[in-house]
Structure formats: structure tokens, C-alpha cells
Interface confidence: low
Amino acid sequence: EVEKTACPSGKKAREIDESLIFYKKWELEACVDAALLATQMDRVNAIPFTYEQLDVLKHKLDELYPQGYPESVIQHLGYLFLKMSPEDIRKWNVTSLETLKALLEVNKGHEMSPQVATLIDRFVKGRGQLDKDTLDTLTAFYPGYLCSLSPEELSSVPPSSIWAVRPQDLDTCDPRQLDVLYPKARLAFQNMNGSEYFVKIQSFLGGAPTEDLKALSQQNVSMDLATFMKLRTDAVLPLTVAEVQKLLGPHVEGLKAEERHRPVRDWILRQRQDDLDTLGLGLQGGIPNGYLVLDLSMQEALS
């Protein structure tokens, strides 16, 4: 807390300018009018204040706006934003994408801080959904942002916003998140032709059901092994050897290197060995020839 003292004669600030960097903390507190500071916040960012001086400026704004800063001030906080606590930010009502961009730009190049997470949460809740422009902005800063959301939060993403998602934005998503995103992506890209559709949908396929994988296998898509290994095991198991061969195209040879890993391992165990032999890859572990194959999936579901 800065002690209240009278402003020395001739030191009353008329403008927010570089002369203030020579003021002691108590002089800033006494000589800078909070309302003046609020109207000239855009200048603060260009002045090399010390962290201690920024603390004083923040304190003045806190006194002026105990219920939370107005957006006109928030947009021009600049590096003062880094001084804000999540509790401060929860008082704000940020509605402008420009304001969000301005504050994210201050934090650019750093990991997502609790302050930024709170800011984004306030912004998205205020908008009611993650629209395309917001998503585009957030993933430009934080490629992992999408995967930090719960499936419930992701359900508010409209299909049109999926166009803003880049493959790297989904790198850390788990299957539950992809389960939510995949149907939206399928809807968003439904009017694209085969090869273009596959390029766009590829990163979302960890949420695809068996029937969609079967459909893709008929389109000469040549799925790479990295994508195949991210598919849901329960979606891969019902695929036939012929369907997997068509789905992977020339990449089918990569199955050998992955035969001990899911979902390839579990898929091999469900195939007839003589079907696996047709691939010529030396995959072992299929159902021996002559054995009767029973579909136990219903029994498993009941037990």
C-alpha cells in the first residue's frame, strides 16, 4: 500500500508522459490523477515504467474502478495487464475481440498464464459460444487452446468455427474431445470433394466411427500411420483386412512396425490369419485358419 502524501508543488501530472519515470512511487500516487491515467492508458505502454511504478498505476485504477475496469481502459492496459490477478480479471466484462487481441498480444510468446485463462474464460462466456473469429484468434496464440477445453465446453463450438482449426491445434486433444469435434468437422467440410475433404478431416479422425472409416476406405485416401494410430480402437476393430489395406494404401507396410501397439495389436487379434497373410507383411496373432469366429461384442456389452 502506498502512503498518501500531498503532491509537491509543480509536480502535478498534466499528461501521462516520459517525465513520470523519474517520479518516486509516492509521487506517482500523489501527483497522477486516476481519471487522467484512465483516459491516457494507451500512453503507459510506450513509457519504460519500473514494475514498482506499474504497481502504483494499477493501484490508482483499482481505486477508481473498484467494481472492475471499463473496456475502454482494458483495451489499452498493455503491459499493465501482466500485473492483473485472475481475481481482478473476473470483475471485467470484455466483449470486443480487439480488446482480447490487444491483451493476448502482450502475453505473446509465453505459456498461457492463469490471468490469460481467466480472460479467455470471461470473454467466451460473455459471447455464449466460441465463434470462428475468437477461435482463430485464440489458436493463433495458443495452438493447444482447443484441447484445454472440456467436452462440454467444446460442444458450444459451432461447426463454422472448425474452419479456423489447424492440425497442430488438435495435437494434445484426447479421444473424448475428438468425439465432440469430429461430428462438427464432418458437418463443416461436408461439401468438399474427396481428397480435399480428407486433408481437412484428417486431424479430427480420432473421433470417427467405424462406418465413416469404412466410407473413407473406398476413396483412395492413403491415410498415414500416424493418423491411423490415433483412431479409436473400437472404431478400427470391425474393419476388415481389405478395408484397412484400402484405407492406408501404400502406408499399409507401416503396420508391421506398429503390430505390438494399439489399435493395430487389437485389430490383428480380430482378423483371420489367412486374411492377414494376404498383406505379405508377416503380421502374426490373427485367428488361426479353421477356427469359428463368434461376435462376442454383444455378450461383452451385457456382461
Partner: antibody, heavy 121, light 110 residues
Framework: QVQLVESGGGLVQPGGSLRLSCAAS????????MGWVRQAPGKGLEWIGY???????YYASWAKGRFTISRDNSKNTVYLQMNSLRAEDTAVYYC???????????????WGQGTLVTVSS | DIQMTQSPSSLSASVGDRVTITCQAS??????LAWYQQKPGKAPKLLIY???DLASGVPSRFSGSGSGTDFTLTISSLQPEDFATYYC????????????FGTGTKVTVL
């Protein structure tokens, strides 16, 4: 059409200062981040820095302190102020516009023709 | 500080050849990479952004690929007007960097 025109280049003595201007036409400067890039004779491209739509500036580590980027949206012009110039600052200086309006860090889609700055006694 | 290493520094090729230029980042830059073409005495021209998106008006023989740290610019069938110098640029970070551009690759007639 969309165009950038640099001006203000020329011969300057070591230790001197120069201000380059970049006049934009065909689009609203206020909507785009703008950057400056230079190229010494026979050398590669060297990024100087840029100014964002909200007037935040970013500089290459070597340019901090000597070079200042500013903009005047009312004149649709961006500036590069260069101080304490050295012989190694001799180069063609380009201004460039970001691809996407309102944002930074995608790449420069529109470039000026460049202006030559020669630092020599 | 993200360093960009471009290779080769120069190459000779003939019209119709398939040409590949690579760019390596010293750390993960996701797909935040642009490619430019520059001819002598001219300003650079944007070819590719976001690693693989073709800029407006650029012929489809140019393509970009890669993400993370390794990127490639490919010219599927070299044309006479493609003899130039090519530069990559990381656009992941603008903080505390020396130069986001690669060193350049000069493509000349064999």
C-alpha cells in the same frame, strides 16, 4: 490498387539519423500490422521489426534502441526512424504489410519497392 | 531465439526439373512458416503462408509442406521465371529474435 511506396532513403554520414516513410494506398493502414525488412547489397533479408494494429512494436534484438517504428493512420503512413547509423546499415529498406487484417505473425503479402540507404563518409 | 537454417544455399536446375528447398527451425514453430521468392532488384513476393497455404495468384506448381521444425518448398516443374532466390520466414515468434528469415536459396540455370 493495393500499394506501398517507401521514401526518405539516401546518403547519410556515420552517426547520422534518417527517417524513412512508407505510404500505403488501396487499403486502410490502421487495419494491418506493418513491418520493415532490409537487405544489404548481395545479402539476404533481415527483419527489423513491425508495429501492430494497436501500436505495439516488436524489434529484432540488434535493432532495439537505434530503430523506432511508428505509424500515422490518418496519413496512411508508417515510419522507420534510424539513429546512430553505421556503414553496416547500408541496405535497401522495404516496408511490408501483414497478410491478415488485424493480426500479426502470418507473413508479409504486400511489399514496397524499397528505398536505398547508404551510410558513408 | 528461433534460428532458421535453409538448405541448400544454392542449386542449379533445368526447366522442367522438380526442385526442393528445405528450411529447419531450431525449435517447434508448428506450421507458422512463410516462403518468399525474390528476383534481382525486386521486392520479395509471398508464395506460401502457414507452411502449406498458397498465397493469392501463386501458380500451383509451388507447394509447401512440413510442420514442427522441418519444412519444404517444392517447385514441381521449374519454369524460366522461377530462377530466383527463395527465403523461408518463421512467423511463430517476434520476441527476442535476431532474424526470422532463412539464409536464402539461389536457384540458377544448369
Amino acid at each position: 490498387q493495393v500499394q506501398l511506396v517507401e521514401s526518405g532513403g539516401g546518403l547519410v554520414q556515420p552517426g547520422g539519423s534518417l527517417r524513412l516513410s512508407c505510404a500505403a494506398s488501396g487499403f486502410s493502414l490502421s487495419s494491418y500490422a506493418m513491418g520493415w525488412v532490409r537487405q544489404a547489397p548481395g545479402k539476404g533479408l533481415e527483419w527489423i521489426g513491425y508495429i501492430s494494429t494497436i501500436n505495439n512494436t516488436y524489434y529484432a534484438s540488434w535493432a532495439k534502441g537505434r530503430f523506432t517504428i511508428s505509424r500515422d493512420n490518418s496519413k496512411n503512413t508508417v515510419y522507420l526512424q534510424m539513429n546512430s547509423l553505421r556503414a553496416e546499415d547500408t541496405a535497401v529498406y522495404y516496408c511490408a504489410r501483414e497478410i491478415r487484417s488485424g493480426w500479426v505473425d502470418y507473413g508479409f503479402s504486400i511489399w514496397g519497392q524499397g528505398t536505398l540507404v547508404t551510410v558513408s563518409s | 531465439d528461433i534460428q532458421m537454417t535453409q538448405s541448400p544455399s544454392s542449386l542449379s536446375a533445368s526447366v522442367g526439373d522438380r526442385v526442393t528447398i528445405t528450411c529447419q527451425a531450431s525449435q517447434n514453430i508448428y506450421s507458422n512458416l512463410a516462403w518468399y521468392q525474390q528476383k534481382p532488384g525486386k521486392a520479395p513476393k509471398l508464395l506460401i503462408y502457414d507452411a502449406s497455404d498458397l498465397a493469392s495468384g501463386v501458380p500451383s506448381r509451388f507447394s509447401g509442406s512440413g510442420s514442427g521444425t522441418d519444412f519444404t518448398l517444392t517447385i514441381s516443374s521449374l519454369q524460366p521465371e522461377d530462377f530466383a532466390t527463395y527465403y523461408c520466414q518463421q512467423v511463430r515468434s517476434s520476441s527476442d529474435i535476431d532474424n526470422p528469415f532463412g539464409t536464402g536459396t539461389k536457384v540458377t540455370v544448369l
